[in-house]
């Protein structure tokens, strides 16, 4: 089941999927001056069986000015600019993508690909949010949103990530104070604090991370 809407927009934050559920579609979009080859795929589709998932179809772009297809090569990294799924300013890898059954990895780029990727997500897809460069999160840990089916309609859970701007303390933006307590949650603390995916830090993809403030029933 495809999700009706896009993941929520969070001020001063971008989102990224670490892996894509089977059934996810990626539009074959070309950059300005290029178009899909005739008889070329409209989209790539994440398909698979119990042991392996991969992207079906290949996207191919050709110059709008020519009729013959161009040879497909993987572009250099610098040719790939600001794709929606790769806007994160720093690495965010809660899990090894390959270790998640029923999911595809990020598809490799294709020649003359558009600068922004357009995905069509399916129910159960999870995306992670991170503050953009120059902003910092009020809370620690990944903020995620999940596409869920409720009463026959799809909706994305709302991450409560807050990204704040200019600093008011003497500390420089690049400096990180050392954590005063370990990453793991103390065993004696069995309840969680708030809210939503903003604070729900223990996820199917990050089982060793900390849980949220109130209860996961908030989901």
């Amino acid at each position: 089941e495809l999700c009706d809407d896009d993941p929520p927009e969070i001020p001063h934050a971008t989102f990224k999927a670490m892996a894509y559920k089977e059934g996810t579609m990626l539009n074959c979009e070309c950059k300005r001056g290029f178009r899909r080859i005739k008889s070329g795929s409209l989209y790539m589709l994440c398909t698979g069986n119990s042991s392996h998932s991969s992207w079906d179809n290949q996207c191919q772009c050709t110059s709008s000015a020519t009729r013959n297809t161009t040879k497909q090569v993987t572009p250099q990294p610098e040719e790939q600019k600001e794709r929606k799924t790769t806007e994160m300013q720093s690495p965010m890898q809660p899990v090894d993508q390959a270790s998640l059954p029923g999911h595809c990895r990020e598809p490799p780029p294709w020649e003359n690909e558009a600068t922004e990727r357009i995905y069509h997500f399916v129910v159960g897809q999870m995306v992670y949010y991170q503050c953009v460069q120059g902003y910092r999160a009020l809370h620690r840990g990944p903020a995620e949103s999940v596409c869920k089916m409720t009463h026959g309609k799809t909706r994305w859970t709302q991450p409560q990530l807050i990204c704040t701007g200019e600093m008011e303390t003497s500390q420089f933006p690049g400096e990180e104070k050392p954590q005063a307590s370990p990453e793991g949650r103390p065993e004696s603390e069995t309840s969680c604090l708030v809210t939503t995916t903003d604070f729900q830090i223990q996820t199917e993809m990050a089982a060793t991370m900390e849980t949220s403030i109130f209860t996961t029933e908030y989901q």
Partner: antibody
Amino acid sequence: EVQLLESGGGLVQPGGSLRLSCAASGFTFSSYGMHWVRQAPGKGLEWVSVISYDGSYKYYADSVKGRFTISRDNSKNTLYLQMNSLRAEDTAVYYCAAGVPDYWGQGTLVTVSS
Amino acid sequence: QSVLTQPPSASGTPGQRVTISCTGSSSNIGAGYDVHWYQQLPGTAPKLLIYSNNERPSGVPDRFSGSKSGTSASLAISGLRSEDEADYYCAAWDSSLNGPVFGGGTKLTVL
């Protein structure tokens, strides 16, 4: 069970100082931004200050900027508010709150009067 | 003066539906920040009633619902009960203050 317990309130003269504390339990304190919010008698809620999960940045309402200082000790699961140069208009119940803020303590009353 | 604007009072009879509005600006609700609603019973601390515009914490009855559009939000209470008599506050993060802002509060009276 999540608990936030404020202490340190009381009667103080104008120009005086107080230090409020908020002891947190039942959740991973070091992962959440924390707030101080106050409520003057018979009035609404007014945000006072916020501190990030690691204490690396802090913000203040204009009404308290330069007089109040928020801090936290993650090893003690405790949030603090140092209040200097207190004025009559600072009289209020002071709540510490976690997250959205979505979980609140019961509050501690600060009275500034001569 | 509060950054978010709420009506100071609202009332209804048991069983009725009442709505409380909350109007903000382009630096808070209009900037895309979530709206949260709190219920404060007399002599107690505020309690989170609705978070992220329309989500209910566990334990909050489905008589309470929230919505958001543009620079405004609203809280609806259906099947009004006497125990709903309380002060209700909306709140949202404000990018110009780098902190949450609150509405002035709405005193709900159940007639």
